[in-house]
C-alpha cells in the first residue's frame, strides 16, 4: 500500500468560451480508494478555489460553468489525489481559455448539385455554426473546411473554405455517390469534430470539361 | 430564491464553545465557496472563513485561526462554524455568505448574534 | 496581508449631492467589490468586478479605478442611499474589507 501516483491534468476544452472542462489522468492509486480535487486560482490573484462541478465533464474531470469562466484571464490549476498513505500533486498547468476552443461541428449541412444551363455543373454546399457559438459578438471567428470523397474511395478530398457558410465544388466524378463533411475551428483553438456525413448522387451526365 | 439562515448564535461565556449552522437552500450548495463573516456591535465587517465548494481549500482569517473550524456538509446543505476558546472580542454578528463564482457575498444570511461575557 | 484603507470615514451630503467615496489598497489588485449596509440589516452586494452594479442598484451608482486605487461614485444622491459602504478585495488570503464610509443626511 502506497501513496496515489502523480496525477496530469491533460486536456481542456471550452465550446464557446463561455464554459469550460479540464480533465486529469490518475497515477496508481497505491492499492487504497483514492479522492481527487482540483484547485486553482487565476493569474493576479492567490486565492485558491476548488473545482465548482465534478460531475458534468465525467469521471476525473472538472467542469467551469459560465459563472467560473473568466475570458482574459488564465487559470493556474493542478490536481491533488489523496489516499491514506499519502498524496501527490499534478504538475501546474495554465489555461486560458481563448486558446482552449472546440466547437461543436457544424450543422444543417445541405448539399446538392446545380447544373446551371450557361455553366459547369458544381456541387453546392452550405451549412450553419454550431449553435453555442455566438458570431454577433466579435469575439469570434470561424473557419471552416470540407472533406468528400466518393463513397468507396480510401482518401478524402479537402477544401478550406475560410469564414464562408458555403462552397462550390466543380471537380467530381460522374455518376458517383460523395460523402460530404464540415468541421470548424476558431482563430485560436482546436478544429471541431466532422460533421455528420451528407451522401449526394453525382448524375452520370455531371460534365466535367467544358 | 436562494436563502440562507443562520442559527446557533447566544450567550456563552469566555472560554466556552458555540457552534454555528446556515441552512442554505434555493442553489446547487456543494457548487459554491461559502464563507463566514462577522461585524461586532458599531464596528465594521471582517471576513473571518472560507471554505471550498469540496472542502478542499480552507482559509481563516488570523484572529480565529486554532481557535475557529470551518466545516460544510454538503448533503445537508448546510455550512457550520466551530468557535472554541471564545473571547470578548469575538462579540459579533455573524454572517453566513457565498461566493458566486468570483464575486463574492453575493447573498448573505440575516445574521446570528454571537455573545461573549460573563 | 492587503490591507483597504477607505476614505472618508463618514460624510454628510443632502440629496440630490454628488458624492464619492474611495478605497486604496496596499497591494495592487484586478478587481475590487462594494456593499451597502443599512442599521440592523444584512451587507447588499453592491458593485461588482470594479464596475458592475449589483441585480437592482440604480444606475447613479457606479464604480471605477484599477490597480490600487478605486472609487464608488453616486451621481445624484437619493434619500435611500444614506447608508454605510465597505469596500473589498477577495483576490488574495486574508479577504479584507475597508473600514467603512458612513454616508448621513447634511
Known amino acids: 500500500q502506497l501513496p496515489p501516483g502523480k496525477p496530469e491534468i491533460f486536456k481542456c476544452r471550452s465550446p464557446n468560451k463561455e464554459t469550460f472542462t479540464c480533465w486529469w489522468r490518475p497515477g496508481t492509486d497505491g492499492g487504497l480508494p483514492t479522492n481527487y480535487s482540483l484547485t486553482y486560482h487565476r493569474e493576479g490573484e492567490t486565492l485558491m478555489h476548488e473545482c465548482p462541478d465534478y460531475i458534468t465533464g465525467g469521471p476525473n474531470s472538472c467542469h467551469f460553468g459560465k459563472q467560473y469562466t473568466s475570458m482574459w484571464r488564465t487559470y493556474i490549476m493542478m490536481v491533488n489525489a489523496t489516499n491514506q498513505m499519502g498524496s501527490s500533486f499534478s504538475d501546474e498547468l495554465y489555461v486560458d481559455v481563448t486558446y482552449i476552443v472546440q466547437p461543436d461541428p457544424p450543422l444543417e449541412l445541405a448539399v446538392e448539385v446545380k447544373q446551371p444551363e450557361d455553366r459547369k455543373p458544381y456541387l453546392w454546399i452550405k451549412w450553419s455554426p454550431p449553435t453555442l457559438i455566438d458570431l454577433k459578438t466579435g469575439w469570434f471567428t470561424l473557419l471552416y473546411e470540407i472533406r468528400l470523397k466518393p463513397e468507396k474511395a480510401a482518401e478524402w478530398e479537402i477544401h478550406f473554405a475560410g469564414q464562408q457558410t458555403e462552397f462550390k465544388i466543380l471537380s467530381l466524378h460522374p455518376g458517383q455517390k460523395y460523402l460530404v463533411q464540415v468541421r470548424c475551428k476558431p482563430d485560436h483553438g482546436y478544429w471541431s469534430a466532422w460533421s455528420p456525413a451528407t451522401f449526394i448522387q453525382i448524375p452520370s451526365d455531371f460534365t466535367m470539361n467544358d | 430564491e436562494v436563502q440562507l439562515v443562520e442559527s446557533g448564535g447566544g450567550l456563552v461565556q469566555p472560554g466556552g464553545s458555540l457552534r454555528l449552522s446556515c441552512a442554505a437552500s434555493g442553489f446547487t450548495f456543494s457548487s459554491f465557496g461559502m464563507n463566514w463573516v462577522r461585524q461586532a456591535p458599531g464596528k465594521g465587517l471582517e471576513w473571518v472563513a472560507y471554505i471550498s465548494s469540496g472542502s478542499s481549500i480552507i482559509y481563516y482569517a488570523d484572529s480565529v485561526k486554532g481557535r475557529f473550524t470551518i466545516s460544510r456538509d454538503n448533503s445537508k446543505n448546510t455550512l457550520y462554524l466551530q468557535m472554541n476558546s471564545l473571547r470578548a472580542e469575538d462579540t459579533a454578528v455573524y454572517y453566513c455568505?457565498?461566493?458566486?463564482?468570483?464575486?463574492?457575498?453575493?447573498?448573505w444570511g440575516q445574521g446570528t448574534l454571537v455573545t461573549v461575557s460573563s | 496581508d492587503i490591507q483597504m484603507t477607505q476614505s472618508p470615514s463618514s460624510l454628510s451630503a443632502s440629496v440630490g449631492d454628488r458624492v464619492t467615496i474611495t478605497c486604496r489598497a496596499s497591494s495592487s489588485l484586478i478587481y475590487l467589490h462594494w456593499y451597502q449596509q443599512k442599521p440592523g440589516k444584512a451587507p447588499k452586494l453592491w458593485i461588482y468586478?470594479?464596475?458592475k452594479l449589483a441585480s437592482g442598484v440604480p444606475s447613479r451608482f457606479s464604480g471605477s479605478g484599477s490597480g490600487n486605487d478605486y472609487t464608488l461614485t453616486i451621481s445624484s444622491l437619493q434619500p435611500e442611499d444614506f447608508a454605510t459602504y465597505y469596500c473589498f478585495q477577495g483576490s488574495g488570503y486574508p479577504l479584507t474589507f475597508g473600514q467603512g464610509t458612513k454616508v448621513e443626511i447634511k
Open positions: 468586478d470594479t464596475s
Open positions: 455568505t457565498r461566493f458566486y463564482g468570483y464575486i463574492p457575498f453575493d447573498y
